[in-house]
Interface confidence: low
């Protein structure tokens, strides 16, 4: 099943977030991703656990799924590179980097993200664009067309009490709160944008959605820029 | 280079289904869009619509909606379309077509089949 | 879906002349985010498959002879062909594919 959705959001203007990547299985959207470069696409390392043998290829310059799209292509993958440190039992370093086949043609629908390299966080009640295909209602509607939602950060401290997520937010990753506005498992790999610059990756671990004390957790790609310049060097 | 073979001529009765197929070489077949176009013996083009070989999804010109179905066999690099409860109007040629690397025109295609439908 | 109006249905040129052909939409194909007028030209000699000529309403496939020209933007297109040869002979076709694909219904070019 794929991985994600956006609850309590509403439909993206079309190809307003040219940076936006669906990852796809067999076809079938898996994950959502970011076009950090123009042969690269972000994800998340955890989507690839249900790829197993079958094709994984990146559509980009999409708003509907199925709908024909001037813009539209979908690509090959050439190279994924999931972070070395990922493990399929924890949410830590849950980044996937994925080498298309070719450079993406780059126009108003397809265009790289730039994403943040200071490593300090976000400050704590900052709206934040977070987006996706993943399904919009607990009953599994999967919405065609791209679904976001803004989403205010959560201090680490809020997000890691003992009713939260107790403690598991280490300072490479960022919370969002989720008070019926959400993202969740399967928007996974997808942006967490604030201010135009690509802060986090929404990350792909099991949790219960729209829950205000389960907020999102999302990977901050600052914390991890040496790797993602050493893998795209 | 990219090329789409299409089959045979096809002599069928009236009320009868046909299948005719499009066997891709030259490029990585689920990585495009496979179109069809039907040309009236005289006239012009239509688009009848496309399937996607990766996840088998399909699109229809509404007005064939009924008439076809469109598949696709991987592992062979072939599309196929099936037209069903054949009647005179559906006597044509029928051409499969790619678009080009990056956007949606149609830069190769198929040699046609011709399809008679003859009591 | 956009409709593609094509005239004349034909005409018939002695080699060596100039010939334009019209092409209009029942809507704009101009997408406004790059510009571009999302237009189609095809060749179809008897017998033959239809062959890409011009796409961008305006830019030669590559191989197709510099006397073939497309003009025109949101509605109203022209194919020109500068000096016609025997080889030209064939029907002409413009084709839309901002919203689905729909084509002209062509004009045939004949050769006095």
């Known amino acids: 099943p794929p991985r994600g959705r956006i609850l309590g959001g509403r439909e993206a203007e079309a190809h307003a977030r040219p940076y936006m990547a669906s990852v796809q299985l067999n076809g079938a959207h898996l994950c959502g991703g970011v076009l950090v470069a123009e042969q690269w696409v972000l994800s998340a390392a955890h989507c690839l656990e249900d790829a197993a043998d079958g094709k994984v290829q990146v559509l980009l310059g999409a708003h509907s799924l199925s709908q024909p799209e001037p813009s539209k292509r979908l690509y090959d993958v050439l190279r994924a590179v999931p972070h070395p440190d990922s493990q399929p039992d924890t949410i830590d370093h849950d980044l996937l980097l994925l080498q298309l086949s070719e450079k993406a043609t780059l126009g108003p629908a397809v265009r790289p993200l730039p994403w943040q390299r200071v490593d300090r966080d976000v400050a704590p009640g900052t709206l934040c664009d977070v987006a996706g295909w993943g399904i919009v209602n607990h009953a599994g509607r999967r919405p065609d067309s791209l679904q976001h939602v803004l989403l205010p950060v959560l201090d680490r401290a809020t997000c890691n009490r003992r009713t939260h997520h107790d403690g598991a937010i280490t300072e490479r990753l960022m919370c969002a709160e989720s008070n019926r506005r959400d993202s969740c498992k399967g928007d996974s790999g997808g942006p967490l944008v604030c201010g135009g610059v690509l802060e986090g990756v929404v990350t792909s671990g099991s949790r219960v959605c729209g829950n205000r004390k389960k907020p999102g957790i999302y990977t901050r790609v600052a914390s991890y820029a040496a790797w993602i310049d050493s893998v795209l060097a | 280079q990219v090329q789409l073979q299409q089959s045979a001529a096809e002599l069928a009765r009236p009320g009868a289904s046909v299948k005719m197929s499009c066997k891709a070489s030259g490029y990585t077949f689920t990585s495009y869009t496979v179109h069809w176009v039907k040309q009236r013996p005289g006239q012009g083009l239509e688009w009848i619509g496309y399937?996607?070989?990766?996840?088998?999804?399909?699109d229809y010109n509404q007005k064939f909606k009924d008439k076809t179905t469109l598949t696709a066999d991987i592992s062979s690099s072939t599309a196929y379309i099936q037209l069903s409860s054949l009647t005179s109007e559906d006597s044509a040629v029928y051409y499969c077509a790619r678009r080009g690397v990056n956007w949606s025109w149609f830069a190769y295609w198929g040699q046609g089949t011709l399809v008679t439908v003859s009591a | 879906n956009i409709m593609m109006t094509q005239s004349p249905s034909s005409l018939a040129v002695s080699a060596g002349e100039k010939v334009t052909m019209s092409c209009k939409s029942s809507?704009?194909?101009?997408?406004?985010?790059?510009?571009?007028?999302?237009l189609a030209w095809y060749q179809q000699k008897p017998g033959q498959s239809p062959q890409l000529l011009i796409y961008?309403?305006?830019t030669r496939e590559s191989g197709v002879p510099e006397r073939f020209t497309g003009s025109g933007s949101g509605t109203d297109f022209t194919l020109t062909i500068s000096s016609v040869q025997a080889e030209d002979l064939a029907v002409y076709y413009c084709h839309q594919y901002l919203s689905s694909w729909t084509f002209g219904g062509g004009t045939k070019l004949e050769i006095k």
């Open positions: 809507q704009s194909v101009l997408y406004s985010s790059n510009q571009k007028n999302y």
């Open positions: 399937i996607n070989p990766s996840s088998g999804f399909t």
């Open positions: 961008w309403a305006s």
